[in-house]
Interface confidence: medium
């Protein structure tokens, strides 16, 4: 599923991401835009043999199990394929664990490079939330 901007903002808000660990909803929508272009089925492979999955591009080295990443920790205790569902519950629950891990949203490279320090509220402007 490819979400619309406001559609995703509403879904993320329903799942309790607005101001989760101090990060406003705009941060999460911005991260999703630049991680996956709002596509729940996005997958991207990394040079270390891991793969990033889903709308927030969650990595198989640490957070989920795809059955083929050497030394996978699977800290979210889920199959990576669950992160590709049109239902973003699994991605959101895992993202909450990631953002609580100490580095906050810096865990997402795209957020660090494209969203951090910008007017992230623009990503939810005009949305009925």
């Amino acid at each position: 599923k490819v979400f619309g901007r406001c559609e995703l903002a509403a879904a993320m808000k329903r799942h309790g991401l607005d101001n989760y660990r101090g990060y406003s909803l705009g941060n999460w929508v911005c991260a999703a835009k630049f991680e996956s272009n709002f596509n729940t089925q996005a997958t991207n492979r990394n040079t270390d043999g891991s793969t990033d999955y889903g709308i927030l591009q969650i990595n198989s080295r640490w957070w989920c199990n795809d059955g083929r990443t050497p030394g996978s920790r699977n800290l979210c205790n889920i199959p990576c394929s669950a992160l590709l569902s049109s239902d973003i519950t699994a991605s959101v629950n895992c993202a909450k664990k990631i953002v609580s891990d100490g580095n906050g949203m810096n865990a997402w490279v795209a957020w660090r490079n494209r969203c951090k320090g910008t007017d992230v509220q623009a990503w939810i402007r005009g949305c009925r939330l």
Partner: antibody, heavy 116, light 107 residues
Framework: QVQLQESGAEVMKPGASVKISCKAT????????IEWVKQRPGHGLEWIGE????????YYNEKFKGKATFTADTSSNTAYMQLSSLTSEDSAVYYC?????????WGQGTTLTVSS | DIELTQSPATLSVTPGDSVSLSCRAS??????LHWYQQKPHESPRLLIK???QSASGIPSRFSGSGSGTDFTLSINSVETEDFGMYFC?????????FGGGTKLEIK
């Protein structure tokens, strides 16, 4: 136990297309990547690419882009590989395997012969 | 692409001999190297994963070692059922690649 059952041998004419199937049992099909491997005598084993059935995400070896197309049907736990514009170079045994990084589980192989 | 070079191409041995098969990678692949045995008209069979971890049900005479670019599959006291082709495969990066194989044959 995990099993991958491939479709039977095919004899095709040059220029035609063929679709090979790989039915998986014994595990959660949508969760694991299915990989496709080509074997020709004297050419060893070549990785064609992979599909994640749960999402339809695919990756192809550059060498096989335009030649192979992967699909999967999660309702029947079956992955498919279509090979198009067949030539004699496509005559080979084609294997599906469960993608664990390594390949512990393989299909029995589908022999494709391309001949006029 | 990472190239895997296996040597020797053919190895002629007598049952009871111990042998070593080599697989060399064109660049470092850490321990992401796996070994397979294949007999005629059969699918490959996983022997060793991650350079040194024995796959389930594999006899203890098979062992693997190495890291980086140089890897070895050792067979301690070859048995007649061990004859066939042996391939290495890397999962360090895409595309996945295989070595050209070593044929283990009876002398």
């Amino acid at each position: 136990q995990v099993q991958l059952q491939e479709s039977g041998a095919e004899v095709m004419k040059p220029g035609a297309s063929v679709k090979i199937s790989c039915k998986a049992t014994g595990y959660t099909f949508s969760t694991y990547w299915i990989e496709w491997v080509k074997q020709r005598p004297g050419h060893g084993l070549e990785w064609i690419g992979e599909i994640l059935p749960g999402s339809g995400s695919t990756y192809y070896n550059e060498k096989f882009k335009g030649k192979a197309t992967f699909t999967a049907d999660t309702s029947s736990n079956t992955a498919y590989m279509q090979l198009s514009s067949l030539t004699s170079e496509d005559s080979a045994v084609y294997y599906c395997a469960r993608g664990d990084g390594w390949y512990c589980y393989w299909g029995q192989g589908t022999t494709l012969t391309v001949s006029s | 692409d990472i190239e895997l070079t296996q040597s020797p191409a053919t190895l002629s041995v007598t049952p009871g001999d111990s042998v070593s098969l080599s697989c060399r990678a064109s660049q470092s692949i850490s321990n992401n190297l796996h070994w397979y045995q294949q007999k005629p008209h059969e699918s490959p069979r996983l022997l060793i994963k991650y350079a040194s971890q024995s796959a389930s049900g594999i006899p203890s005479r098979f062992s693997g070692s190495g890291s980086g670019t140089d890897f070895t599959l050792s067979i301690n006291s070859v048995e007649t059922e061990d004859f066939g082709m042996y391939f290495c495969q890397q999962s360090n990066s895409w595309p996945r690649t295989f070595g050209g194989g070593t044929k283990l044959e009876i002398k």
